[in-house]
């Protein structure tokens, strides 16, 4: 199941109501409104599936619905990465893929989606109520994370239904650039709307969507902060936590955000063999809004990558020394 922001269809104002100047100032707010509604709100979907053939085998698929370029994907279980979750896999488009038991195979499915096969027996086996989280670091959006789980009652071979409540968690990254412009635009929009409140506003028509497309979820900051304050992380059955095998699992992992070297002398190409798996039509997904720590009174576990991702095509080394010396 995908959720997409439904952009209101613009209905031109009736002719003769305003002069040229008035027309321009009236159209501008709606253009800005469209930008405010749609821009800067990428989403992450998570699909958890139990394989019918092997009951202890899970497939986790995650995708990023945004326009930015993905710099890193972290898959964890037992809660979000850095908040008690245990890292299962880390995927970088150019620098490679690393996974930890019981993850068996992590791979890119498309340039914006990944899949991870988990298998286990005994203590390291995932169980049905385990929460799996995917964190996408992208430029310029910043860091976005979503979580999903398979309900205990799910039949093998079936995908998880949508997760009932969003687990809100995002880094402050990515809101400085594009979002700053949008914020200014939104403030300007409000100013214009107040100036024109005595004038009749153009009518809004919902855009036509396909029958499958669900209705838009418009997360206003106030709603987001409320949810962030009221939706706790899912409780995890501790018996399903990973056991130490050959690997001592990297809880949290290094706070690498600010110092990832790219080594790139030129803009590297992504993995050569991108599969063409479509985004799933159904599955468990949660969208995460960016930059909610301030409202939720929560401190981000890492410095967000958006603060140190580099527009320079030569990568961070163009601005920093080796290893991002601080």
């Amino acid at each position: 199941m995908r959720t997409e922001a439904q952009v209101p269809a613009l209905q031109p104002p009736e002719p003769g109501l305003e002069g040229a100047m008035g027309h321009r100032t009236l159209v501008l707010p709606w253009v800005l409104l469209t930008l405010c509604v749609t821009a800067g709100t990428p989403e992450v979907w998570v699909q958890v599936r139990m394989e019918a053939t092997e009951l202890s085998s899970f497939t986790i698929r995650c995708g990023f619905l945004g326009s930015g370029s993905i710099s890193l994907v972290t898959v964890s279980w037992g809660g979000p990465n850095g908040a008690g979750g245990t890292t299962l896999a880390v995927l970088h488009p150019e620098r490679g893929i690393r996974q930890w038991a019981p993850a068996r195979q992590a791979r890119w499915e498309t340039q914006s989606s990944i899949s991870l096969i988990l298998e286990g027996s005994g203590a390291s086996s995932p169980c049905a109520n385990t929460t799996f989280c995917c964190k996408f670091a992208s430029f310029p959006e910043g860091s976005w994370e979503a979580c999903g789980s398979l309900p205990p009652s799910s039949d093998p071979g079936l995908s998880a239904p949508p997760t009932p409540a969003p687990i809100l968690r995002a880094d402050l990254a990515g809101i400085l650039g594009v979002s700053g412009v949008l914020l200014f635009g939104c403030v300007y929009l409000l100013h214009l709307l107040r100036r024109h409140k005595h004038r009749p506003a153009p009518r809004l028509q919902p855009s036509r969507t396909s029958p499958q497309a669900p209705r838009a979820r418009a997360w206003a900051p106030s709603q987001a902060s409320q949810a962030a304050l009221h939706v706790p992380y899912a409780t995890i059955n501790t018996s399903c936590r990973p056991a130490t095998l050959d690997t001592a699992h990297p809880h949290g992992g290094p706070s690498w955000w600010a110092s990832l070297p790219t080594h790139a002398a030129h803009r590297p190409q992504g993995p050569a063999a991108w599969a063409s798996t479509p985004i799933p039509a159904r599955g468990s997904f949660v969208s995460v809004e960016n930059g909610l720590y301030a409202q939720a009174g929560e401190r981000p576990p890492h410095t967000g990558p958006g603060l140190t991702l580099f527009p320079d095509p030569r990568g961070p080394r163009a601005m920093e020394g080796p290893l991002g010396v601080r």
Epitope: V90, G96, I97, P250, G253, A272, V325
Partner: antibody, heavy 119, light 107 residues
Amino acid sequence: EAQLQQSGPELVKPGASVKISCKASGYTFTDYYMNWVKQSHGKSLDWIGDINPDNGGSTYNQKFKGKATLTVDKSSSTAYMELRSLTSEDSAVYYCSASGPPYVLLDYWGQGTSVIVSS
Amino acid sequence: DIQMTQSPASLSASVGETVTITCQTSENIYSYLAWYQQKQGKSPQLLVYNTQTLAEGVPSRFSGSRSGAQFSLKINSLQPEDFGSYYCQHHYGVPLTFGAGTKLELK
């Protein structure tokens, strides 16, 4: 500039143990996994394992389980590898190497520590 | 574990020549193959990763390519500083494994 400074050469007797060190400087120690790689004389490279300095979690190549133990001291930004029950097969140059996410590329290398096992 | 079969084991060439080293993998590693250069008595250094991305400071005479499970490192117009050993390594999961190496010697 990032640097990995390894301890000096070791001459040890068969059956003994040895602990070699790798001191990191010029970067935040906990941001990179520390890998250890073995290079026998005139031969290829063998990955021993790595350690996450942030929490001490380690991963070993099955081939070196029971032979090598990886540890870190965050306060001194130093990684250690202990090799036990040494035989002549363990005579080699051992390198430490720092790797950034996703911890599968060996970005920076120490100068190597020569270990010679001889009676 | 992923096996890396590197060839040739040794290679003699002159300054100005072009040489190619290959590496075959036992499993699909997508484009996640790296090359390291090791000069006599020194530590290895990352040269190329993700098949063809040059590490920082690596001259453009080095280039990487892939054909199926076979990966190649090509060095155009060999320079005196290019002589030494070259190793391939997959960067698709652990354990990390390396090719046996290619020793590039001055003819």
